[in-house]
């Protein structure tokens, strides 16, 4: 390594290396200064003169110490289903993420390339797994004693109210209707309270209810990309 007082450009010691903010210029055979984030090499170094750096032009950037002759172009503007979470500056690329109610179906190094709308569970089905930034909602049929009467990407199956006298029994898509006296709520098996989705967003694995194997029992079988599964509405 060079003595700490070596000024660029300088010839490294035999077998030595340049410092971290320097690069070895093959033509000059010297250790030369890199340019900081937000700049690029306007003039490369020679044996007697160091690198000359210049600011990146509008809509271009460099994020690292570099010796590139031109700055990188910022990505295109965010699409209508996205929000710009980081603006294009001289030191960083634009970052687009999916807006609420959407998730990232195809990500890129930073941000999202393709957003898709979160699946909505139709009446009789509730959210088994909420959507995240990179995964879609998973729906499940409401278990006996629970219901969902909404088309929603956030609502879970809720327990039927318990009646002293039942006017209309509840089913998977409708609450029980009681007569006269005030009802109470049960905590029926399978009524799992899920948190709200982190945000929205990923792979289309659609759960499909399997054929019933026993009264009140159902399984969720993840399958590959397919038309919207039972219990979900199209995007």
């Amino acid at each position: 390594l060079p003595a700490q007082v070596a000024f660029t450009p300088y010839a490294p010691e035999p077998g030595g290396t340049c410092r971290l903010r320097e690069y070895y210029d093959q033509t000059a055979q010297m250790c030369c200064s890199k340019c900081p984030p937000g700049q690029h090499a306007k003039v490369f170094c020679t044996k007697t003169s160091d690198t000359v750096c210049d600011s990146c032009e509008d809509s271009t950037y460099t994020q690292l110490w570099n010796w590139v002759p031109e700055c990188l172009s910022c990505g295109s503007r965010c699409s209508s289903d996205q929000v710009e979470t980081q603006a294009c500056t001289r030191e960083q690329n634009r970052i687009c993420t999916c807006r609420p109610g959407w998730y990232c179906a195809l990500s890129k190094q930073e941000g999202c390339r393709l957003c898709a709308q979160l699946r909505k569970c139709r009446p009789g089905f509730g959210v088994a797994r909420p959507g995240t930034e990179t995964s879609d909602v998973v729906c499940k049929p409401c278990a006996p004693g629970t219901f969902s009467n909404t088309t929603s990407s956030t609502d879970i199956c809720r327990p039927h109210q318990i009646c002293h006298v039942v006017a209309i029994p509840g089913n998977a898509s409708m609450d029980a209707v009681c007569t006269s006296t005030s009802p109470t709520r049960s905590m029926a098996p399978g009524a799992v309270h899920l948190p709200q989705p982190v945000s929205t967003r990923s792979q289309h694995t659609q759960p499909t209810p399997a054929p019933s194997t026993a009264p009140g029992t159902s399984f969720l079988l993840p399958v590959g990309p397919s038309p919207p599964a039972e219990g979900s509405t199209g995007d």
Epitope: F7, S33, P37, W65, E91
Partner: antibody, heavy 118, light 110 residues
Framework: QSVEESGGRLVTPGTPLTLTCTVS????????ISWVRQAPGKGLEWIGI?????NTAYATWAKGRFSISRTSTTVDLKITSPATKDTATYFC???????????????WGQGTLVTVSS | AYDMTQTPATVEVAVGGTVTINCQAS??????LAWYQQKPGQRPKLLIY???DLASGVPSRFSGSGSGTEYTLTITGVECADAATYYC????????????FGGGTEVVVK
């Protein structure tokens, strides 16, 4: 080889003051120079930097309050409108590179004391 | 911003002991970190640059390590002469920077 600061004195608030960093034993043609200050009993605080192309960069809090300029042998720091909070020892330091991002400082002056008081 | 947070503010160590000082950057600074030693009434002195490279004349009991956002200065076999305040300094960016230096760590030798 050395760098030396001068110009520190007692000033009243609002009176502009210019400090000078003079180098000897080396040329200012290949190195950036930073100004750093240290309030009594406090830590080091970077103010700003100038390179041989007269490009400058400043700490966010220093923009508009300080300006750095240079000649072939000196680097000046102007405190545009000193306040009592600017009371400190002011150092100039030689950078090993010639960029407006400080790399590291291999040479420091002894410092010059600025006292701002009414 | 690349804010530098140094811990601890003060550390006591016996002669012959080992002391570790930490410096954390708010974003990755790609090993562009230097350490300085300053004794009361004196100018700062460069100890280490590029995270781990010793400046000339600096004893080998001083060493530096780290990467990304976390960096460490270690003094092994502490001597009385090591009583001082130590500062880290990032060399990655000067855009929207409050200070390139950490807040400092005072090393008290018992």
């Amino acid at each position: 080889q050395s760098v030396e600061e001068s110009g520190g004195r007692l000033v009243t608030p609002g009176t502009p003051l210019t400090l000078t960093c003079t180098v000897s034993g080396f040329s200012l043609s290949s190195n950036a120079i930073s100004w750093v200050r240290q309030a009594p009993g406090k830590g080091l605080e970077w103010i700003g930097i100038i390179n041989t192309y007269d490009n400058t960069a400043y700490a966010t809090w220093a923009k508009g309050r300080f300006s750095i300029s240079r000649t072939s042998t000196t680097v000046d720091l102007k405190i545009t409108s000193p306040a009592t909070k600017d009371t400190a020892t002011y150092f100039c330091a030689r950078d090993v590179h010639n960029n407006v991002v400080p790399y590291y400082f291999d040479m420091w002056g002894q410092g010059t004391l600025v006292t701002v008081s009414s | 911003a690349y804010d530098m947070t140094q811990t601890p503010a003060t550390v006591e160590v016996a002669v012959g002991g080992t002391v570790t000082i930490n410096c954390q950057a708010s974003q990755s600074i790609s090993n562009l970190l230097a350490w300085y030693q300053q004794k009361p009434g004196q100018r700062p002195k460069l100890l280490i640059y590029d995270t781990s490279d010793l400046a000339s004349g600096v004893p080998s009991r001083f060493s530096g390590s780290g990467s990304g956002t976390e960096y460490t200065l270690t003094i092994t076999g502490v001597e009385c002469a090591d009583a001082a305040t130590y500062y880290c300094q990032q060399g990655y960016s000067s855009s929207n920077i409050d200070n390139v230096f950490g807040g400092g760590t005072e090393v008290v030798v018992k």
